[in-house]
């Protein structure tokens, strides 16, 4: 039901400035998803810029199945995962390595979902039960967003109603919180 399959297609983008972001993803199960880590060597001198357009962000395409109770989509859907840390575009390596290669001394820039798309999905059910039609919200693009101290202190809470779609394999958090763990709304869903 979680991350059923994926394609590790890393795309480097230089996204535009936008509205308040969804909180960035903190994916828990990195065994089931091939998450791209920033790779390469650290620069000799700290890179500082105030222009977000100079920061680049990695989009990973992956596929997953949509489920609803015992029912599952006939075909997987494809969406993006926005790979955590943003780095200076000119220093972003072509190869995906493992090491953390750049750490800003100033404000934190995160790679977060920018645009979403809705997709209608037909789910097939066992035991002769009628198929179900559902809509899912998929990440369509990512962007770099400067996180202020407020963002960090508020644990990246939702800034708008249309904020987050939780990652599969995680506890859902859109507009809600777990009854057992009284945690912040939309806790790190994105």
């Amino acid at each position: 039901q979680g991350w059923q399959a994926f394609k590790n297609d890393a795309t480097e983008i230089i996204p535009e400035l936008g509205e308040y972001p969804e909180p960035p993803p903190e994916l828990e199960n990195n065994k089931t998803m091939n998450r791209a880590e920033n790779g390469g060597r650290p620069p000799h001198h700290p890179f500082e810029t105030k222009d977000v357009s100079e920061y680049s962000c990695r989009e990973l395409h992956f596929t997953r199945y949509v489920t609803d109770g015992p029912c599952r989509s006939a075909k997987p859907v494809t969406e993006l995962v926005c790979s955590g840390q943003c780095g200076p575009a000119r220093l972003l390596p072509n190869a995906i390595g493992r090491g953390k290669w750049w750490r800003p001394s100033g404000p934190d820039f995160r790679c977060i979902p920018d645009r979403y798309r809705a997709q209608r999905v037909q789910l097939l059910c066992p035991g002769g039960e009628a198929p179900r039609a559902r809509k899912v919200r998929l990440v369509a693009s990512c962007k770099c967003k400067r996180l202020t101290r407020f963002h960090n202190q508020s644990e990246l809470k939702d800034f708008g109603t249309e904020a987050a779609r939780p990652q599969k394999g995680r506890k859902p958090r859109p507009r809600a919180r777990s009854a057992k763990a009284n945690q912040a709304e939309l806790e790190n869903a994105y």
Partner: antibody, heavy 122, light 107 residues
Framework: EVQLQQSGADLVKPGASVKLSCTAS????????IHWVKQRPAQGLEWIGR????????TYVPKFQGKATITADTSSNTAYLQLRSLTSEDTAIYYC???????????????WGQGTSVTVSS | EIVLTQSPALMAASPGEKVTIACSVS???????LHWSQQKSGTSPKLWIY???NLASGVPVRFSGSGSGTSYSLTISSMEAEDAATYYC????????FGSGTKLELK
């Protein structure tokens, strides 16, 4: 802010038809399913059906087939419920609701309109 | 059609009292498809708990939900005046069906 604004109360005569509206703000109805529910005075909730405004495809409970027609106009971000051949049994409050998108494999109506009261009386 | 039966239909609780509302389903459903709504007199319903146990935004943590298969419940650990309302269980599989509702009053 997500809101569903429904049309005002209606007093209609038996045998007539009525068309209720549900205008969305804060989201695009094309991206969601819109549901309609009936609540008779001092009674429970009854699902009528839903529509996918993106393609106009609607689903109904058998009981409401022929009685209700759900349509949508994406240009005005509005969904409609038309009720025909009205009788006293149709006197109720009708609510529209939005089916939330993908709550991590949970699907439920997460926002409701304020309701439209329909009274059928001669 | 799946039928949801709620019990009790009407109950009264004192402030601080623990409250449990039961919802019995005519045939087994996935816990992801069972939800609860709260409705106060003269207002529209509000999604209260979704997927059996997940609280919707703004719902106090004194509320909880549990269950599986054909038996589900909503629990308030300590009744407060603002909790007086009618609670509906509902399931959404191929059709949306609601329980008949439990009216909870303040004693």
């Amino acid at each position: 802010e997500v809101q569903l604004q429904q049309s005002g109360a209606d007093l209609v005569k038996p045998g007539a038809s009525v068309k209720l509206s549900c205008t969305a703000s804060g989201f695009n109805i094309k991206d969601y399913y819109i549901h309609w529910v009936k609540q008779r005075p001092a009674q429970g909730l009854e699902w009528i059906g839903r529509i996918d405004p993106d393609n106009g495809e609607s689903t109904y409970v058998p009981k409401f087939q022929g009685k209700a027609t759900i349509t949508a106009d994406t240009s005005s971000n509005t969904a409609y419920l038309q009720l025909r051949s009205l009788t006293s049994e149709d006197t109720a409050i009708y609510y529209c609701g939005r089916e939330g998108l993908d709550y991590g494999d949970y699907y439920a109506v997460d926002y409701w309109g304020q309701g439209t009261s329909v009274t059928v009386s001669s | 059609e799946i039928v949801l039966t709620q019990s009790p239909a009407l109950m009264a609780a004192s402030p601080g009292e623990k409250v449990t509302i039961a919802c019995s389903v005519s045939s087994s459903i996935s816990s992801t498809n069972l939800h609860w709504s709260q409705q106060k007199s003269g207002t529209s319903p509000k999604l209260w708990i979704y997927g059996t146990s997940n609280l919707a935004s703004g719902v106090p943590v004194r509320f909880s939900g549990s269950g599986s298969g054909t038996s589900y419940s909503l629990t308030i650990s300590s009744m407060e005046a603002e909790d007086a309302a009618t609670y509906y269980c509902q399931q959404w599989s191929t059709t949306y069906t609601f329980g008949s509702g439990t009216k909870l009053e303040l004693k």
